[in-house]
């Protein structure tokens, strides 16, 4: 089949824009650390890089292959307010490189870490 | 309480970076349209803008207040492969502005649309 060059160019552009790579995302701090329901953070979210995007096949998953850690200082508020906001320093995982990995390999990797 | 200027500056930066606004995201086309499990798209994902980020309170939700539509041509593949990839044209909702809205208002809005 012969396809229009413009269509092929735009499809190629879509492939590039959606590939598996570190992407800036908003992390809800309370949810990330599973804190008590009466503990709040200001700001409630932080911006970090996490692997995201799409892989070329159903059996592949976009996973981080290297991680750095970013230290951020936020205010922690506990209600009822017996004292003012307390500064807390939190270290966040920041994905620096990613790869499309077989879901089976990911499963094995996770389970070998758990088994250790 | 007196807080270090550096801390306040970095917190302000975090607020700005994580605010509710249109963000570039990857949409898995098959999941978005809930198609049959033997229908695949190449590329499998497209890049569009959707509202995201955090609101200042639990009771608020980041919602789109205006939407444009982006037309993209992809290839659809049905397995088993009895014929080649077929072009499909998809108009994707692309959020152009966002606002933190009360979850109750969002619920009312959605249900008034459904009730119409």
């Amino acid at each position: 089949a012969h396809y229009n060059t413009e269509i092929l160019k735009s499809i190629d552009n879509e492939w590039r824009k959606t590939q598996c790579m570190p992407r800036e995302v908003c992390i809800d701090v309370g949810k990330e650390f599973g804190v008590a329901t009466n503990t709040f953070f200001k700001p409630p979210c932080v911006s970090v890089y996490r692997c995201g995007g799409c892989c070329n096949s159903e059996g592949l998953q976009c996973m981080n292959t290297s991680t750095s850690y970013l230290s951020k200082t936020l205010f922690e508020i506990t209600v009822p307010l017996s004292q003012g906001p307390k500064p807390v320093t939190i270290s966040f995982a920041n994905h620096t490189s990613c790869r499309c990995m077989s879901k089976l390999d990911v499963y094995r990797q996770v389970h070998s870490i758990i088994r250790r | 309480a007196h807080y270090n200027t550096e801390i306040l500056k970095s917190i302000d930066n975090e607020w700005r970076k994580t605010q509710c606004m249109p963000r570039e995201v990857c949409i898995d086309v098959g999941k978005e349209f809930g198609v049959a499990t033997n229908t695949f798209f190449k590329p499998p994902c497209v890049s569009v803008y959707r509202c995201g980020g955090c609101c200042n309170s639990e009771g608020l939700q980041c919602m789109n207040t205006s939407t444009s539509y982006l037309s993209k041509t992809l290839f659809e593949i049905t397995v088993p492969l009895s014929q080649g990839p077929k072009p499909v044209t998809i108009s994707f909702a692309n959020h152009t502005s966002c606002r933190c809205m009360s979850k109750l208002d969002v619920y009312r809005q959605v249900h008034s649309i459904i009730r119409r």
């Epitope: - | 978005e32 349209f33 809930g34 049959a36 939407t67 998809i90 108009s91 994707f92 909702a93």
Partner: nanobody, 118 residues
Framework: QLQLVESGGGLVQPGGSLRLSCAAS????????MGWYRQAPGKQRELVAA???????LYADSVKGRFTISRDNAKNTVYLQMNSLKPEDTAVYYC????????????WGQGTQVTVSS
Amino acid sequence: QLQLVESGGGLVQPGGSLRLSCAASGSSFSPYAMGWYRQAPGKQRELVAATTSGGSTLYADSVKGRFTISRDNAKNTVYLQMNSLKPEDTAVYYCYMHWRGSDPENYWGQGTQVTVSS
């Protein structure tokens, strides 16, 4: 039990129009996505058109500009307006509805026959 009921199929001359409809009974929630597939004799089932509650729409290039998909959330119904019908549009048309959630589910209609012939 959730059921999808299609109607509107039939015999039509080339260049004519038909409007298919598909209604879901047994669900109080509106599906996230709704759409239509078709299957011609001896051929694979192919995607024709689809729509999401977020306003996105999809059309196979073979029907683009001739077919229009629309939905009525209040009635949990999806429509396919088919204009300028061609003999190659002859097929059984199946609607589907997709509910999102922790366990996404698809439901299918029983199919409605569309025949384009002079």
